[in-house]
């Protein structure tokens, strides 16, 4: 049965998933999908990493931790009730049937109090993404917008604005973890 995680409407949800790379920088492809883990890969993919980088992601889904050290926990920004359900974290360890699959159940609760409206930075506008797609017609790389001028301080500030650190800290120790090598 799936491990259950909770978040309130409007919060960022945190779904923990970890592995220990065999050596620093020796990364393993990981995918996150909405729905239980199927036989191969992930269904309804929301985010992927390869041996080097995040190579596909969709709006509101991102990795907050240091995925180069094996923290592939998923953050879902500004959740709604529709985000409830099972999510698959799949760590695609090379070899014969070596994949590690974790099904995590996200339960979204209505917000207790409607907060006063606050101006939020648009994360996806600040980070237009390059989607490297597999087998998706002749144009296999789609560039959505161009990267704006943005410095490391801005990136760090933006990440801090979007991070729900209390929830992350609470759940980190209960996440799915696998050691490789």
């Amino acid at each position: 049965s799936e491990v259950e995680y909770r978040a309130e409407v409007g919060q960022n949800a945190y779904l923990p998933c970890f592995y220990t790379p065999a050596a620093p920088g020796n990364l393993v492809p990981v995918c996150w999908g909405k729905g239980a883990c199927p036989v191969f890969e992930c269904g309804n993919v929301v985010l992927r990493t390869d041996e080097r980088d995040v190579n596909y992601w969709t709006s509101r889904y991102w990795l907050n931790g240091d995925f180069r050290k094996g923290d592939v926990s998923l953050t879902i920004e500004n959740v709604t009730l529709a985000d409830s359900g099972i999510y698959c974290c799949r760590i695609q360890i090379p070899g014969i049937m070596n994949d590690e699959k974790f099904n995590l159940k996200l339960v979204i609760k209505p917000a207790k109090v409607t907060p006063a409206p606050t101006r939020q930075r648009d994360f996806t506008a600040a980070f237009p993404r390059m989607l490297t797609t597999r087998g998706h017609g002749p144009a296999e790389t789609q560039t959505l917008g161009s990267l704006p001028d943005i410095n490391l301080t801005q990136i760090s500030t933006l990440a801090n604005e979007l991070r729900d650190s209390r929830l992350a800290n609470d759940l980190r120790d209960s996440g799915a973890t696998i050691r490789i090598g």
């Epitope: 729905g35 239980a36 199927p38 036989v39 191969f40 269904g43 309804n44 797609t133 087998g135 296999e140």
Partner: antibody, heavy 123, light 107 residues
Framework: EVQLVESGGGLVKPGGSLRLSCAAS????????MTWVRQAPGKGLEWVAS????????YYLDSLKSRFTISRDNAKNILYLQMNSLRAEDTAVYYC????????????????WGQGTLVTVSS | DIQMTQSPSSLSASVGDRVTITCRAS??????LTWYQQKPGKSPKLLVY???TLAEGVPSRFSGSGSGTQFSLTISSLQPEDFANYYC?????????FGQGTKLEIK
């Protein structure tokens, strides 16, 4: 046009070996999971093995993984199935199939199939 | 292993009939179900994936439904070219498994 053409089938004695090939064309081979499925005469379909894009991850029917090896050569656009210690019950038409894929889905079903190659194991 | 049971194993029908083939999984497979059509001497053809999504180029008279353990493939008005064998396949659990097939024949 997507094409998958199997070869390498034939008559082999029990205990013998065969290597099947599947030549792919009309698509970017290295972007797709590939799979072998077999069908014994007059019977249904049975999954045999699958391999991921770069060949680093392989998946087998448990009862076959000690005797069968799936591999691929992305430079040549060829999928292979090495079959050792063949038995009469391995007699079947062997199909190679492409795992359906687009960037938000998973390759767990097969959108193109080859015509199949018949493997007969008999003394 | 997840067992897939199709019914009926064979079915006689006429052109224009509405027919439904069912597939039952031995455990919950969510919507991870595919339907294929296979004509004698030919390779299988993808019809429906994820239980209800019609594959490209498949006529709209075909439809899939169901989730969990119970699934069905419906052909709303049979055409002569639809007489064939039909297989369901689950892609939730390893190994991938197929139903035993349903033979759709002309009455």
């Amino acid at each position: 046009e997507v094409q998958l053409v199997e070869s390498g089938g034939g008559l082999v004695k029990p205990g013998g070996s065969l290597r099947l090939s599947c030549a792919a064309s009309g698509f970017t081979f290295s972007d797709y999971y590939m799979t072998w499925v077999r069908q014994a005469p007059g019977k249904g379909l049975e999954w045999v093995a699958s391999i991921n894009y770069d060949g680093r991850n392989t998946y087998y029917l448990d009862s076959l993984k000690s005797r069968f090896t799936i591999s691929r050569d992305n430079a040549k656009n060829i999928l292979y199935l090495q079959m050792n210690s063949l038995r009469a019950e391995d007699t079947a038409v062997y199909y190679c199939a492409r795992g359906y894929y687009y960037y938000g889905s998973s390759p767990n079903y097969f959108d193109y199939w080859g015509q199949g190659t018949l493997v007969t194991v008999s003394s | 292993d997840i067992q897939m049971t199709q019914s009926p194993s064979s079915l006689s029908a006429s052109v224009g009939d509405r027919v439904t083939i069912t597939c039952r999984a031995s455990e919950n497979i969510y919507s991870y179900l595919t339907w294929y059509q296979q004509k004698p001497g030919k390779s299988p053809k993808l019809l429906v994936y994820n239980a209800k999504t019609l594959a490209e180029g498949v006529p709209s008279r075909f439809s899939g439904s169901g989730s969990g353990t119970q699934f069905s493939l419906t052909i709303s008005s049979l055409q002569p070219e639809d007489f064939a064998n039909y297989y369901c396949q689950q892609h939730y659990g390893t190994p991938l498994t197929f139903g035993q097939g349903t033979k759709l024949e002309i009455k």
